[in-house]
């Protein structure tokens, strides 16, 4: 969490941002809140990016002002206009690109004063893994697949019964570049699987950590998966 305060002149206002991560090829949100004002027409929101000449986005007098917007953000940004009055200056970013990573500044002017806060935005790719029994294999085998990751993640297998066991010798992981030549499909195969056990396929890079669990018994197969973003810090 980054909390910024205004500078001299008018009173300072508190602006708060949260470091976050964007998933390439999806929409993202850059979070920013501020001390609200009574009149929407008195609020100015400017989003800037370090190293970029034009503005990322500007909102003033109750509407978007696009004349100074930088080419790289063309048609890809919007604030939540109906929430500005309650102090939400968060930016919605469409079709996140790898190049969107960097340091952003959320700069606010209201009738109460000015304030700003920086935000670190990471970009990469992360997706939920799916673990299945590979019936085509000669022995009992599990196959863990996740369609989109970047940077290249690590893949680790674990089991409930054999806690602490190292499965690297009985697993094989491959990374296949996707068609846009940035993200990769992750496929990991675990051999010599025993029945009545829960196995976990854990995929992790510096942006996200995802786990796919599978429980195989005589009568049924149960699956569960979850994904968690790393390093979300508020400022």
């Amino acid at each position: 969490l980054i909390i910024g305060f205004g500078i001299s002149g008018r009173h300072s206002i508190t602006v708060t941002t949260v470091a976050s991560a964007g998933n390439i090829g999806e929409d993202g949100i850059l979070s920013c809140t501020f001390e609200p004002d009574i009149k929407l027409s008195d609020i100015v929101i400017q989003w800037l990016k370090e190293g970029v000449l034009g503005l990322v986005h500007e909102f003033k007098e109750g509407k978007d002002e696009l004349s100074e917007q930088d080419e790289m953000f063309r048609g890809r940004t919007a604030v939540f206009a109906d929430q500005v009055i309650v102090g939400n200056a968060s930016l919605r970013l469409k079709n996140v690109q790898l190049t969107d990573a960097g340091t952003y500044k959320c700069y606010i002017i209201t009738s109460k004063g000015k304030g700003n806060a920086n935000l670190e935005y990471k970009t990469g790719a992360f997706s939920m893994p799916e673990v299945n029994v590979d019936y085509n294999a000669s022995s009992e085998t599990l196959r863990c697949e996740a369609p989109r990751w970047f940077p290249q993640p690590t893949v680790v297998w674990a089991s409930q019964v054999d806690q602490g066991a190292n499965f690297s010798e009985v697993s094989n992981t491959s990374f296949e570049l996707n068609s846009e030549n940035v993200t990769m499909k992750v496929v990991s195969v675990l051999y010599n699987v025993t029945i009545n056990n829960t196995y976990s396929c854990m995929i992790e890079n510096d942006i996200a950590k995802a786990t796919g669990d599978i429980k195989v018994t005589e009568s049924e197969i149960k699956r569960r998966s979850h994904l968690q973003l790393l390093n979300s810090k508020a400022s």
């Epitope: 998933n23 090829g25 999806e26 929409d27 509407k63 978007d64 002002e65 696009l66 004349s67 917007q69 063309r74 048609g75 890809r76 919007a78 919605r92 469409k94 079709n95 790719a125 997706s127 369609p147 989109r148 996707n178 068609s179 846009e180």
Partner: antibody, heavy 120, light 107 residues
Framework: EVQLVESGGGLVQPGGSLRLSCAAS????????MSWVRQAPGKGLEWVAY????????YYSDSVKGRFTISRDNAKNTLYLQMSSLRAEDTAVYYC?????????????WGQGTTVTVSS | EIVLTQSPATLSLSPGERATLSCRAS??????LHWYQQKPGQAPRLLIK???QSISGIPARFSGSGSGTDFTLTISSLEPEDFAVYYC?????????FGQGTKLEIK
Amino acid sequence: EVQLVESGGGLVQPGGSLRLSCAASGFTFSNYYMSWVRQAPGKGLEWVAYVSSGGGSTYYSDSVKGRFTISRDNAKNTLYLQMSSLRAEDTAVYYCARESYSQGNYFDYWGQGTTVTVSS
Amino acid sequence: EIVLTQSPATLSLSPGERATLSCRASQSISDYLHWYQQKPGQAPRLLIKFASQSISGIPARFSGSGSGTDFTLTISSLEPEDFAVYYCQNGHSFSLTFGQGTKLEIK
């Protein structure tokens, strides 16, 4: 050659449901945002919804929010529109459209459309 | 929501004449405006992107201009195949609104 072929339209009663499909070919489907745009008889174009290239992000027009669901299956190169709680005013030709790759928000390729009629 | 208003609703001209179609936005959208042509029974076709940028395969007689709130599509010398409905589209926000259309008909 880029091709978008819609299917699944038909006659449905008010309150009913329908699922439209759009089969894409001739381009790398998984790289593009996709949208549905509709056109009521004798009327203009109305954007309905978009889905991101990976399928994880969606956005809807206010007129269909909460009733329609856009989705995609990149393995099958297919875009979907699940329509429920249909109303007479949803009667239209539904087009699937590809958003431009570099900077979105305009549609460089369109399908020929599939007709949805909501009537009792 | 950004509202686009096109004028005139109908434009009656003869082949060889110059056509000027207007599109006005309810608030400034810089140059984030696109133009489409639609013929009866067909899907729309992209003509101009970002107010004035030409599209590959579209004849040079089609041109666009404008910025902010006022935009113009010009067809320098009408061909018989140009008689159709023309739509402008807001390319700025996440809700991608269209104008109501201008019908270009043969006089």
